[in-house]
């Protein structure tokens, strides 16, 4: 029951994940990992924040949004087919069994090559259309699995299906949002 997102080879993929700090600067550690969320922590960590900053990241993985405001959405640069799979966003709220974890499924499709006149074929093949926006199209599924019920968070899932890939910036609204405090 993971939320599913799609991107084409060569695009930047965008995996939304949000929380609302109780007050400005009241940040919560977050980890992103490749693979479904385990019982604790993240497996195969690709990026991690602490209460102040991004303290670990790997090549091609970065936070494009303002993580100090709770936007911890992950951008993966220039994706390949090997980037397909489940990613875990874990909001590490201090306390026993207090973490919020979200599994997001990334599906990478081969790049579309637009048919072109014969004389342009070589040019088109060498330079396929690439999107440089931070988003990459609509979420295919908007159903979140059961979420931990914890004392200090109020959980809501925002937005419905996005139908237009031009609404890249609106992808943020399809992420899971939790309020801390």
């Amino acid at each position: 029951s993971e939320v599913e997102y799609r991107a084409e080879v060569g695009q930047n993929a965008y995996l939304p994940c949000f929380y609302t700090p109780a007050a400005p600067g009241n940040l919560v550690p977050v980890c992103w990992g490749k693979g479904a969320c385990p019982v604790f922590e993240c497996a195969n960590v690709v990026l991690r924040t602490d209460e102040r900053d991004v303290n670990y990241w790997t090549s091609r993985y970065w936070l494009n949004g303002d993580f100090r405001k709770g936007d911890v959405s992950l951008t993966i640069e220039n994706v390949t087919l090997a980037d397909s799979g489940i990613y875990c966003c874990r909001i590490q709220i201090p306390g026993i069994m207090n973490d919020e974890k979200f599994n997001l499924k990334l599906v990478i499709k081969p790049a579309k090559v637009t048919p072109a006149p014969t004389r342009q074929r070589d040019f088109t093949a060498a330079f396929p259309r690439m999107l440089t926006t931070r988003g990459h199209g609509p979420a295919e599924t908007q159903t979140l699995g059961s979420l931990p019920d914890i004392n200090l968070t109020q959980i809501s899932t925002l937005a419905n299906e996005l139908r237009d890939s031009r609404l890249a910036n609106d992808l943020r609204d399809s992420g899971a949002t939790i309020r801390i405090g």
Partner: antibody, heavy 118, light 113 residues
Framework: QVQLQQSGGGLVQPGGSLRLSCAAS????????MSWVRQAPGKGLEWVSG????????YNADSVKGRFTISRDNSKNTLFLQMNSLRAEDTAVYYC???????????WGQGTLVTVSS | EIVMTQSPDSLAVSLGERATINCKSS????????????LAWYQQKPGQPPKLLIY???TRESGVPNRFSGSGSGTDFTLTISSLQAEDVAVYYC?????????FGQGTKVEIK
């Protein structure tokens, strides 16, 4: 007052199964996360398993993953620990414990001894 | 997971004297946003379950005598029994509830000298 009454311990052979129960009174079980903590003879405390108030989320220590299942019946105010594929190293006193506000263990059951031996 | 290490393993103190138990965590259990240390202390007497003594590092549980006090921050914590009584003979455990699985120290046995 809050009470946690445990039952279900005993002697079992390696590979066997046991089900522990923890009957809660003095509070509404569904309002609190709960845990099982064990203590091997002469040793310290080890967290084993935990469950959210609704029962929708469960957590297990690596040492028991795939073998132990925590569950709860909120209508009966009872917590359970199903233990399968038991090993000698699972021999311990098992305590159920109420978690206060996702933080510390504020009430504990009296404990029940599980002995795994052939 | 966070590893909790207590010292000493055992302690013999004369009645009426001060007993001090130390607890060290492998990483900070201080959450800077609320300035709280996610650390508790428990007392376990022979044949009994553990009993919560102190939480949030220094807050005594209801009914716990004021001779018990907790202090520290970050990774280093202390439980102090200001004037040891016979009924204080027990094993004492620290526990972090900051992140991952909740973990306990190995315990410190307090005896009468």
């Amino acid at each position: 007052q809050v009470q946690l009454q445990q039952s279900g311990g005993g002697l079992v052979q390696p590979g066997g199964s046991l089900r522990l129960s923890c009957a809660a009174s003095g509070f509404t079980l569904s309002s609190y996360a709960m845990s099982w903590v064990r203590q091997a003879p002469g040793k310290g405390l080890e967290w084993v398993s935990g469950i959210s108030g609704s029962g929708g989320s469960t957590y297990n220590a690596d040492s028991v993953k795939g073998r132990f299942t925590i569950s709860r019946d909120n209508s009966k105010n009872t917590l359970f620990l199903q233990m399968n594929s038991l090993r000698a190293e699972d021999t311990a006193v098992y305590y159920c414990a109420k978690i206060f506000g996702s933080y510390y263990f504020d009430y504990w059951g009296q404990g029940t001894l599980v002995t795994v031996s052939s | 997971e966070i590893v909790m290490t207590q010292s000493p393993d055992s302690l013999a103190v004369s009645l009426g004297e001060r007993a001090t138990i130390n607890c060290k965590s492998s990483q900070s259990v201080l959450y800077s946003s609320n300035n709280k240390n996610y650390l508790a202390w428990y007392q376990q007497k022979p044949g009994q379950p553990p009993k919560l003594l102190i939480y949030w590092t220094s807050t005594r549980e209801s009914g716990v005598p004021n001779r018990f006090s907790g202090s520290g921050s970050g990774t280093d914590f202390t439980l102090t029994i200001s004037s040891l009584q016979a009924e204080d003979v027990a094993v004492y455990y620290c526990q972090q509830y900051y992140s991952g699985p909740p973990t306990f120290g190995q315990g410190t046995k307090v005896e009468i000298k």
